[in-house]
């Protein structure tokens, strides 16, 4: 327990003291106080540094004094032959005596008593930042005007901490600046502005001053700005060691001020501003930035083009521009959207033709469509070469958009006819060599195919029969092989306005206008046995002269059956109107006189009993083509004669060009336009 | 296909939080920005902001900053929304959408009460 | 914050009429509008983006138009599924900004 005063005598004391005795007191007074050791009576053998018996007053780990030999008082008035004065509160005295003694040695007698210790003077280390106050037992310290104490009670400092500056622009200095700053003071300022600003911090050199590094270089007071994870200093001296502009691409900012004990140095004095929050000049590639500038800040907007050949993608939708925004973090809204090549899709199909897989589908690929040769050919030009073009469409130089239209190649029999074997009145035939004919089975009759969805033929195969039943590619028209064919289906049958119907059909003498149109539902596909025949063309090469040479064909009446069941041709000439008007007409169902012969019509025939006979209406007259010699065109349609094996009619196909044409051009689909 | 799934409904009292899921299938949301609209009762829809789940960027509207985060999880292919501090007005549908040039893609919404 | 003001804010029809809503921003936002449209108990369904361009699959009878600040959507005849509430957002500039809405409902 400690106490306030105590004393301390040597072992047997008065009486001499034992030899080899060791001996020590453990002295405690009071926190705050100090100790007042005093000696009343020393006798203790001499010896050299007290080496054999001695007493030792130690404080801490610190020898005090040690004591031996005879002292006496130097003042009349006091009885202290020795003293010790410690500012501590314990003490430790220990006494020690050897194995002999030369004499008779009394020891001695201390005293201790606790006092007072000036703690604001007593010691080296100032127990005060500032003002220390000494009372009996303890010290206090204290502050000067607006400092504060801290919570170890002894150091002060300013309250220089808590301020926040929201203002997009502003000033923040040291405290008292110019004046010498606080010592021993953390000093933390916040700058908080609007997301989308950066805090751009400048500073003056000569507007900072702050005590230098040490030898270390490590700063005594410092000045540190934090702006999220980056920080920038910690920054001390004379003038501003930093970079004068500080951009911090960050909304938030810290500064923290941190000084010792020590210095008089004036401090700093910075501005701050808030400056929009830049975002980087990026390299959007294939695409271009409006407005272009130099540098780019929060909420500006541009707007970024795609090249020509570029889009952005969303699903099955693209655009070929968008907006970006520099946004408040510094980043480009939008960043994901990029320019990519325009995908132009697998081309579109053809009919009657193929486009080959193209490597590739994008911007500036090369496909090239093909019609399905030799039967069909690319009727609308442009060699069937297309690009992908930069609006995302297969362009043709010729065509633009439009695809290709691969349309029969017409009058090019596969096989050419050849008067093989001389049977009366004609030769067998192949319907390779004659693809265009069309076989009616009611009535009994041919037709000309003149494209996909038209059969030509006579007006009166049709008159009785508006829905005919029609067949192509076949050579035979025996059931069993008609079966096998390709049969037509009719979707409307156009007679010439000209064709006068009659009540009763077989007394007819006027063939005039003897065409009519069949209008097929589907179309009809192609080949070395289906093709068309072409039309004659209106200028004066398509003018029939006599001795021009035709070929017609059909199931029709021969000189040994009344039908023929294998395809029969012949090759006739071109004869002028007059032969035909003279021949006389077999079984004649009226006066000769009676039969009606028109510029519409064509006589042909007379040679080596060659003709067309009943059965064979409405099949083509196919003339080769004066400008193209590997084509044949329907320059005539049977239609009636006076007598079979002499001379026979057809109908003047040229006549009739533009009806068919207008009839053909009112009555076809989209598909066909 | 692309579709949007988002968590059950939820009642919360005020002052409490609440996470909001959109689980994306047919598409990964990596490549798209992940948004989220809230619609009051009765009332029109409103932006709240959005994520670029690659690397987690967000932009939320003023009126939210602070009481919204939106996250996403790139593993599970999903996108977050977390609402704090609620008050009787947050009560709303909150829906998530998927965009690059638009809002193409909606989440069926997910009802979001604050009553005490 | 861009404001974005629909006219009007609710409008009656018959199946067949052509209605106009527009749409007003209180800056300029060029193209960048869309519109949704939204029945009730739906989420909202995209119709037109970039102002003028038909979201696919949206029928032709739905069309937009405009740029800068002013803006309409036009449905050239009103077909029964047609009535709900029609929306516009702007994706100028952050934050994305929708109109306020305009109810279509059936005369």
């Known amino acids: 327990e400690p106490t306030m005063y105590g004393e301390i005598l040597s072992p047997n004391y008065p009486q001499a003291y034992p030899s080899e005795v060791e001996k020590s007191w453990d002295i405690e007074v009071p926190e705050g106080y100090g100790i007042h050791l005093y000696f009343t009576h020393l006798d203790i053998e001499l010896s050299e540094n007290c080496a054999y018996d001695s007493v030792q007053i130690i404080s801490g780990d610190t020898e005090e004094g040690r004591l031996c030999g005879q002292r006496s008082s130097n003042n009349p008035h006091s009885p202290i032959v020795e003293e010790f004065q410690v500012p501590y509160n314990k003490l430790q005295v220990i006494f020690k005596s050897d194995f002999s003694n030369e004499e008779r040695f009394t020891g001695f007698a201390a005293y201790y008593v606790a006092t007072d210790i000036n703690e604001c003077t007593d010691f080296v280390d100032v127990p005060c930042s500032h003002f220390c106050n000494n009372f009996i037992g303890g010290y206090f310290c204290s502050c000067p005007p607006e400092y504060f104490l801290h919570d170890d009670m002894k150091n002060c400092g300013v309250n220089c901490s808590g301020d926040v500056f929201t203002a997009l622009i502003g000033e923040i200095a040291s405290p008292n600046y110019p004046k010498p700053y606080p010592e021993n003071s953390r000093c933390e300022y916040q700058i908080r502005l609007e997301k989308g600003f950066q805090v751009v911090v400048t500073l003056r050199r000569e507007d900072f001053d702050v005590e230098a590094a040490d030898s270390a270089g490590n700063c005594l007071d410092s000045l540190v700005f934090v702006a999220g994870d980056r920080q920038f200093g910690p920054y001390c001296g004379h003038g501003f060691p930093g970079p004068l502009n500080i951009e911090t691409k960050s909304n938030a900012l810290d500064i923290i001020f941190q000084t010792d004990l020590t210095g008089q140095k004036k401090g700093w004095k910075l501005r701050y501003h808030g400056d929009p929050m830049p975002c980087p000049k990026e390299d959007t590639p294939n695409s271009t930035w409006e407005p272009a500038k130099a540098k780019y800040v929060f909420r500006d907007v541009v707007q970024i083009t795609c090249l020509d050949g570029f889009e952005v993608v969303e699903g099955r939708v693209g655009a070929t521009s968008f907006y970006s925004t520099c946004q408040s973090n510094g980043k480009w809204s939008n960043s994901k959207l990029k320019c990519q090549p325009v995908d132009c899709g697998i081309p579109e199909s053809i009919e009657n033709g193929k486009v080959e897989d193209p490597e590739s589908t994008l911007f500036g690929s090369v496909i090239r469509y093909t019609c399905e040769e030799p039967y069909y050919y690319m009727e609308n030009g442009g060699g069937g070469e297309y690009h992908c073009a930069g609006n995302g469409s297969w362009v043709n130089e010729v065509l633009g958009p439009e695809l290709p239209k691969c349309v029969p190649v017409c009058g090019v029999p596969r096989e050419p006819f050849e008067e093989k074997q001389r049977i009366i009145g004609g030769s067998d035939a192949d319907i390779k060599n004659f693809p265009w004919q069309v076989f009616f089975d009611n009535p009994w009759a041919g037709g000309a195919l003149i494209n996909e969805y038209w059969v030509l033929t006579a007006a009166h195969v049709v008159e009785g029969n508006r829905e005919p039943t029609m067949y192509v590619g076949s050579t035979s028209v025996q059931t069993s092989r008609l079966a096998k064919s390709k049969m037509l289906t009719p979707e409307h049958v156009f007679i010439h306005p000209g064709w006068k119907l009659l009540e009763v059909p077989e007394g007819r003498t006027n063939f005039d206008n003897d065409i009519a149109l069949v209008r097929l539902k589907d179309p009809v596909k192609m080949g070395p046995t289906v093709s068309p025949i072409c039309l004659p063309g209106t200028s004066s090469d398509y003018n029939l002269m006599d001795g021009d040479l035709g070929l017609i064909s059909g199931w029709g009446r021969t000189e040994k059956r009344d039908r023929a069941v294998r395809l029969k041709a012949a090759r006739l000439p071109v004869a002028p109107l007059r032969k035909c008007k003279e021949v006389k007409v077999e079984k004649p169902t009226a006066d000769a006189e009676a039969y009606v012969f028109t510029p519409n019509m064509i006589c042909a025939g007379g040679e080596k009993g060659m003709d067309s006979c009943k059965g064979d209406s409405g099949g083509a007259f196919a003339v080769q083509d004066p400008n193209d010699k590997t084509k044949f065109y329907a320059a005539g349609l049977v239609s009636w004669g006076p007598q079979c094996g002499t001379y026979g009619l057809y109908t003047r196909v040229k006549n009739y060009v533009d009806w068919i044409m207008k009839t053909m051009q009112e009555n076809s689909t989209p598909r066909e336009d | 296909q692309v579709q949007l799934v988002q968590s059950g409904a939820e009642v919360k009292k005020p002052g409490a939080s609440v996470k909001v899921s959109c689980k994306a299938s047919?598409?990964?949301?990596?490549?798209?920005?992940m948004h989220w609209v809230r619609q009051a009762p009765e009332q029109g829809l409103e932006w709240m902001g959005w994520i670029d789940p690659e690397n987690a960027d967000t932009i939320y509207a003023q009126k939210f900053q602070g009481r919204v985060t939106i996250t996403a999880d790139t593993s599970t292919n999903t996108a977050y929304m977390e609402l704090s501090s609620l008050r009787s007005e947050d009560t709303a549908v909150y829906y998530c959408a998927r965009s690059r040039l638009f809002f193409a893609y909606w989440g069926q919404g997910t009802l979001v009460t604050v009553s005490s | 914050d861009i404001q974005m003001t629909q006219s009007p804010k609710s409008l009656s029809a018959s199946v067949g009429d052509r209605v106009t809503i527009t749409c007003r921003a209180s800056q300029d936002v060029r193209t960048a509008l869309d519109w949704y449209q939204q029945k009730p108990g739906q989420s909202p369904k995209l119709l037109i983006y970039s102002a003028s361009y038909r979201y696919s699959g949206v029928p032709s009878r739905f069309s937009g138009s405009g740029s800068g600040t002013d803006f309409t959507l036009t449905i050239s005849s009103l077909q029964p599924e047609d009535f709900a509430t029609y929306y516009c957002?702007?994706?100028?500039?952050?934050?994305?900004?929708f109109g306020q809405g305009t109810k279509l409902e059936i005369k």
């Open positions: 957002q702007q994706q100028y500039t952050t934050p994305y900004t």
């Open positions: 047919g598409f990964n949301i990596k490549e798209y920005y």
